[in-house]
């Protein structure tokens, strides 16, 4: 990090050391060096000497002017050329920052992932501010009117144990930095309505070589929620568009879903669930690959990290979700 300079003078910025990106700014340097009437004053930005837009104001002070300053961060310092000194003399340095006031936070979303013990609140922060921006999440009980505030720089996890004011709350987010402050709309939540069931996972697949070959996908979740609605999407890996099947599910046993697929094609499957009738879905599960056989029955399990081809038996991995560009959480 930046170490302090023993200053032999003063450096300052107008309008301020943190300012709106695109502004015209002036940096002033005033020398106070014993036995030195500076012959010349130099400005450096990020360790590189500036050549232009420097004006000498008086014997000890100079001004560096920037038009339309667009740098998110710069370290400035200035030096003096003193008579009879072989080297320049350091005067002082300062960090400067430019950025934007925060946008109004929108798309405020709060969910409780089953078994997590937390309510997770997220929001769209808007455009990059470039400067340190803090967020205060306000949670107000509609029953007790008690309000709690949580400071963060991104999302927030709030322990459900700390939500003692009943089931209904108002949640809103305040964004603030050196250049401004904005507040989101209020989100009304009921704790029972925002629970997302424990993750559904595809464990294996098999293709049964009947008259019409049939692929069975085995999948499960550890959820204790009784009424769960799920979607399974699948497509050939060469395709862009997904096919979607919907299920009303009871997870007291492993689910088996049947698909009639084209032979000798590699397919990818994903599943997600929600509490029936509620608003929020799980993120899509990890990608699960299965190649249908030409004739031989095949089983796919998550035992290996890569496809193995061995005497007609295909064993393929579950690849992690970041392999797909369309693997967003779809919360909301």
């Amino acid at each position: 990090g930046i170490t302090n300079i023993n200053c032999s003078g003063h450096i300052w910025v107008e309008p301020a050391t943190i300012f709106k990106m695109g502004m015209n700014i002036s940096i002033y340097c005033q020398a106070a060096i014993k036995n030195c009437q500076p012959r010349k004053l130099h400005f450096y930005k990020n360790g590189i000497k500036e050549r232009f837009q420097i004006t000498r104001i008086n014997k000890t002070t100079a001004r560096l002017w920037y038009k339309n300053f667009l740098e998110p961060h710069a370290s400035m310092y200035c030096t003096a050329e003193c008579p009879k000194h072989f080297q320049e003399t350091l005067i002082c340095g300062k960090d400067i920052s430019s950025g934007y006031p925060p946008d109004i936070p929108d798309e405020v979303t709060c969910v409780i992932y089953e078994y997590s013990g937390n309510m997770t609140c997220t929001w769209n922060a808007g455009k990059l501010t470039y400067i340190d921006t803090k967020y205060v999440v306000h949670v107000k009980s509609l029953e007790t009117e008690e309000e709690q505030q949580y400071l963060t720089s991104s999302y927030i996890n709030i322990s459900t144990d700390s939500l003692q004011g009943g089931k209904k709350y108002l949640v809103w987010v305040q964004a603030a930095n050196a250049l401004g402050m904005e507040e989101s709309k209020q989100l009304q939540i009921h704790l029972d309505d925002i629970v997302i069931p424990s993750a559904a996972v595809i464990s294996r697949a098999e293709t049964i070589n009947a008259t019409v070959p049939k692929t069975i996908i085995y999948w499960d979740s550890q959820t204790t929620i009784e009424k769960v609605s799920c979607e399974m999407r699948y497509k050939a890996t060469t395709n862009q568009t997904w096919n979607v099947k919907e299920f009303d599910t009871n997870f007291t046993y492993v689910q088996q879903s049947e698909f009639y697929l084209e032979p000798n094609i590699k397919y990818v499957f994903q599943v997600r669930c929600q509490e029936t009738g509620k608003r929020y879905w799980q993120p899509w599960s990890s990608l699960f690959f299965h190649k249908t056989p030409e004739t031989v029955p095949q089983v796919t399990s998550k035992a290996f990290q890569h496809d193995t081809w061995n005497s007609g038996l295909t064993v393929a991995s579950i690849s992690t979700g970041h392999l797909t560009s369309d693997n967003r959480g779809d919360i909301g």
Partner: antibody, heavy 122, light 111 residues
Framework: EVKLVESGGGSVKPGGSLKLSCAAS????????MSWVRQTPEKRLEWVAY????????YYPDSVKGRFTISRDNARNTLYLQMSSLRSEDTAMYYC???????????????WGQGTTLTVSS | DIVMTQSPASLAVSLGQRATISCRAS??????????MNWFQQKPGQPPKLLIY???NQGSGVPARFSGSGSGTDFSLNIHPMEEDDTAMYFC?????????FGAGTKLELK
């Protein structure tokens, strides 16, 4: 963990063009000035481009001036080097490097990527 | 441009002994009492790693057996005691002014 990953290297003919990329992670990219440094097959290191945090200031040595252009996309945390009118002497491993100030006045290349190779040959 | 001349081009040192690498700048790399001289280590297949900045300050995580000294135009990097892991190329670099320039490197090997 600070990570710089270069890509885009390859083989081109003299006079050709190529664009290198450097994906940054593990630090606030927009707060750092960045550079490209190349290493010739003879292992000589040569600084080839500098860019300030917002891209307003760029500097190059005479050997590449007018042929190379450094740029950055702070929203994507990515640094670029557009190279044109390539010559055989541009053949090198190209590294992107972060510049860090240990004081206001003293900047060093504190983190380097693993590099990407450019070969210019007919 | 400031030209950096490194010597020797290669060096073989026994385990536990001292390795000294020199670097001379074509003009002073000092200003306002600071020497703008840095040292890097590079192992095969790896990028350079910062060892020493401002002539004598150790980079983060750099073992104490690496030390730098000098001012003006003459600088040196000392490694003592020499360890097997220190086999590498070493480069000096001036950061006083653009264009920033490097020495041609010194190959350090075990004797």
């Amino acid at each position: 963990e600070v990570k710089l990953v270069e890509s885009g290297g390859g083989s081109v003919k003299p006079g050709g063009s190529l664009k290198l990329s450097c994906a940054a992670s593990g630090f606030t990219f927009s707060r750092y000035t960045m550079s490209w440094v190349r290493q010739t097959p003879e292992k000589r290191l040569e600084w080839v481009a500098y860019i300030s945090t917002g891209g307003g200031d760029t500097y190059y040595p005479d050997s590449v001036k007018g042929r190379f252009t450094i740029s950055r996309d702070n929203a994507r945390n990515t640094l670029y080097l557009q190279m044109s009118s390539l010559r055989s002497e541009d053949t090198a491993m190209y590294y992107c490097a972060r510049r860090t100030s240990y004081s206001y006045y003293n900047y060093v290349f504190d983190y380097w990527g693993q590099g990407t190779t450019l070969t210019v040959s007919s | 441009d400031i030209v950096m001349t490194q010597s020797p081009a290669s060096l073989a040192v026994s385990l536990g002994q001292r390795a000294t690498i020199s670097c001379r700048a074509s003009e002073s790399v000092d200003n306002y009492g600071i020497s703008f001289m840095n040292w890097f280590q590079q192992k095969p297949g790896q990028p350079p790693k910062l060892l020493i900045y401002a002539a004598s300050n150790q980079g983060s995580g750099v073992p104490a057996r690496f030390s730098g000294s000098g001012s003006g135009t003459d600088f040196s990097l000392n490694i003592h005691p020499m360890e097997e892991d220190d086999t590498a190329m070493y480069f000096c670099q001036q950061s006083k002014e653009v264009p920033w320039t490097f020495g041609a490197g010194t190959k350090l090997e075990l004797k």
